[in-house]
């Protein structure tokens, strides 16, 4: 008995060939011996089976002695033994229809689990192997699970179902809902305008939800909500914003926040959460603000940074085109009795400058100028 594998929702063509290369009488029946279709001369006739409105043949092939049974929009319950009767012969074909679906939705939040469920006909014992877009292979039986989805899991998953040494391939598009970056740091000089951007790593037709930015200032004992907003069909509308600081928000995606000026009291860490409609859980992106200030008070030139800096960052004070006068892995450095000239305060990581602030030290009889 010939075995043919089919995919739920697809179309399958079961072949039946006569030795005579001409149109002769044929019938396709199911295992209950109920007629599915056949011919009456050059006319196609259909029986009362459940396949009545989904079964067809190719009349153009009848003259060549080919009498296929085409079944459209396959269902799991179409799995059956189909019998073609032609020239006093019976050809039997076993059709096994499989379906592979993702749990509830193919749009999942980062960190959530993906479960792929195989629908199979009774009596079958298929094996399934799936390959993720990043090349990870998972194997299983009726269900396959992947926990802690990552951004790289977005894309087409290719799953192969194996039964009776035959295979059928499924492709499932999975979208992992996440921000492009899990975390970002913005380095600013005191007084500069700060731009925070939260680009999403996916695109969908309609995006609706609500979000909030909580901020933990380095100097503050507790965090506070800086802004809450709604998202409707990719349009952003602010619901509530603090008076200090008074953040501004872009009306379109990507989510964009503007802090009018960087001040030491704002330096710290924020967590932007986005709750999407019809999704359990939230998207998160951490954002950090590091603020630098260079000042001269009497005979002391000081450079300070506030905010979440890594211990390996170097803070230096140097006179322009000269070697660093002071360089420390600390959040404040100073020079006593600095000589006149343009001083640079540098925050760097392995020689790469992250933040720079210049301060002009005038001869001792004048006051300092900050360009």
């Amino acid at each position: 008995k010939k075995v043919v594998l089919g995919k739920k929702g697809d179309t399958v063509e079961l072949t039946c060939t006569a030795s005579q290369k001409k149109s002769i009488q044929f019938h396709w029946k199911n295992s209950n011996q109920i007629k599915i279709l056949g011919n009456q001369g050059s006319f196609l006739t259909k029986g009362p089976s459940k396949l009545n409105d989904r079964a067809d043949s190719r009349r153009s092939l009848w003259d060549q002695g080919n009498f296929p049974l085409i079944i459209k929009n396959l269902k799991i319950e179409d799995s059956d033994t189909y019998i073609c009767e032609v020239e006093d012969q019976k050809e039997e074909v076993q059709l096994l229809v499989f379906g592979l679906t993702a749990n509830s939705d193919t749009h999942l939040l980062q960190g959530q689990s993906l479960t792929l469920t195989l629908e199979s006909p009774p009596g079958s014992s298929p094996s399934v192997q799936c390959r993720s877009p990043r090349g990870k292979n998972i194997q299983g039986g009726k269900t396959l699970s992947v926990s802690q989805l990552e951004l790289q899991d977005s894309g087409t998953w290719t799953c192969t179902v194996l039964q009776n040494q035959k295979k059928v391939e499924f492709k499932i598009d999975i979208v992992v809902l996440a921000f492009q970056k899990a975390s970002s740091i913005v380095y600013k000089k005191e007084g500069e305008q700060v731009e925070f951007s939260f680009p999403l790593a996916f695109t969908v037709e309609k995006l609706t939800g609500s979000g909030e930015l909580w901020w933990q200032a380095e100097r503050a004992s507790s965090s506070k909500s800086w802004i809450t907003f709604d998202l409707k069909n990719k349009e952003v509308s602010v619901k509530r914003v603090t008076q200090d600081p008074k953040l501004q928000m872009g009306k379109k995606l990507p989510l964009h926040l503007t802090l009018p000026q960087a001040l030491p009291q704002y330096a710290g860490s924020g967590n932007l959460t986005l709750a999407l409609e019809a999704k359990t859980g939230k998207l998160h992106q951490e954002v950090n603000l590091v603020v630098m200030r260079a000042t001269q008070l009497q005979k002391n030139l000081t450079c300070e940074v506030w905010g979440p800096t890594s211990p390996k960052l170097m803070l230096s004070l140097k006179l322009e085109n000269k070697e660093a006068k002071v360089s420390k892995r600390e959040k404040a450095v100073w020079v006593l009795n600095p000589e006149a000239g343009m001083w640079q305060c540098l925050l760097s990581d392995s020689g790469q400058v992250l933040l720079e602030s210049n301060i002009k030290v005038l001869p001792t009889w004048s006051t300092p100028v900050q360009p």
Epitope: H27, N32, Q33, I34, K35, Q40, T45, K46, G47, P48, S49, K50, N52, D53
Partner: antibody, heavy 120, light 107 residues
């Protein structure tokens, strides 16, 4: 044992729409074809059409342009609408369950039938 | 559509008689034929399926035969409770079609 009960007006005016409902009791409406068959007084049986629980239908070509069948699985009911009726549509209307089993396809359960008269 | 022609349209026989009804299809329907019995004021009841198979619970005096286009229904020994109209019905193709019926009466 599954039972079927037809309901609907016994009298319909010419050119109007005949509407009948069949309620399935003591069994599930799922995974069967449900049909309507009519019988004018003293005459033979005429298959009107059938509907599957998924909503897919097959109608008798002679009545196709006037028939609408629907199914409500939550209420265990299926319905027939026959538009633009004439006196020729006067008959006993049966709702029935069609069954497929080995070598058999046909009606295994019938309603008791409801008489519909088309008259002004 | 497949036309089903039943004959005779009515017959009268005595209790114990052998009664034969024929049904002819307008085209080859293999053995896709049912026979139903309908008593006055009642819904039809299945007696024979696939031309010759007796439905469970149906008395063995009822039988059927035939294939292709010509079919026969027989009551080997007519009983008073067999007074009814008998219909053949094809299920080779849709629409399902019935014969015109044969009314059986007792002499």
């Amino acid at each position: 044992q599954v039972q079927l009960q037809e309901s609907g007006p016994g009298l319909v005016k010419p050119s109007e729409t005949l509407s009948l409902t069949c309620t399935v009791s003591n069994g599930s409406i799922s995974d069967y074809y449900w049909s309507w068959i009519r019988q004018p007084a003293g005459k033979g049986l005429e298959w009107i059409g059938r509907i599957y629980t998924s909503g897919s239908t097959n109608y008798n070509p002679s009545l196709k342009s006037r028939i609408t069948m629907s199914v409500d699985t939550s209420k265990n009911q299926f319905s027939l609408e026959l538009s633009s009726v004439t006196a020729a549509d006067t008959a006993v209307y049966y709702c029935a369950r069609e069954l497929e089993r080995y070598y058999f396809y046909g009606v295994d359960v019938w309603g008791q039938g409801t008489t519909v008269t088309v008259s002004s | 559509d497949i036309q089903m022609t039943q004959s005779p349209s009515s017959l009268s026989a005595s209790v114990g008689d052998r009664v034969t009804i024929t049904c002819q299809a307008s085209q080859d329907i293999s053995n896709y034929l049912n026979w139903y019995q309908q008593k006055p004021g009642k819904a039809p009841k299945l007696l024979i399926y696939a031309a010759s198979n007796l439905e469970t619970g149906v008395p063995s005096r009822f039988s059927g035969s035939g294939s292709g286009t010509d079919f026969t229904f027989t009551i080997s020994s007519l009983q008073p409770e067999d007074i009814a109209t008998y219909y053949c019905q094809q299920y080779d193709s849709l629409p399902l079609t019935f014969g015109g019926g044969t009314k059986v009466e007792i002499k």
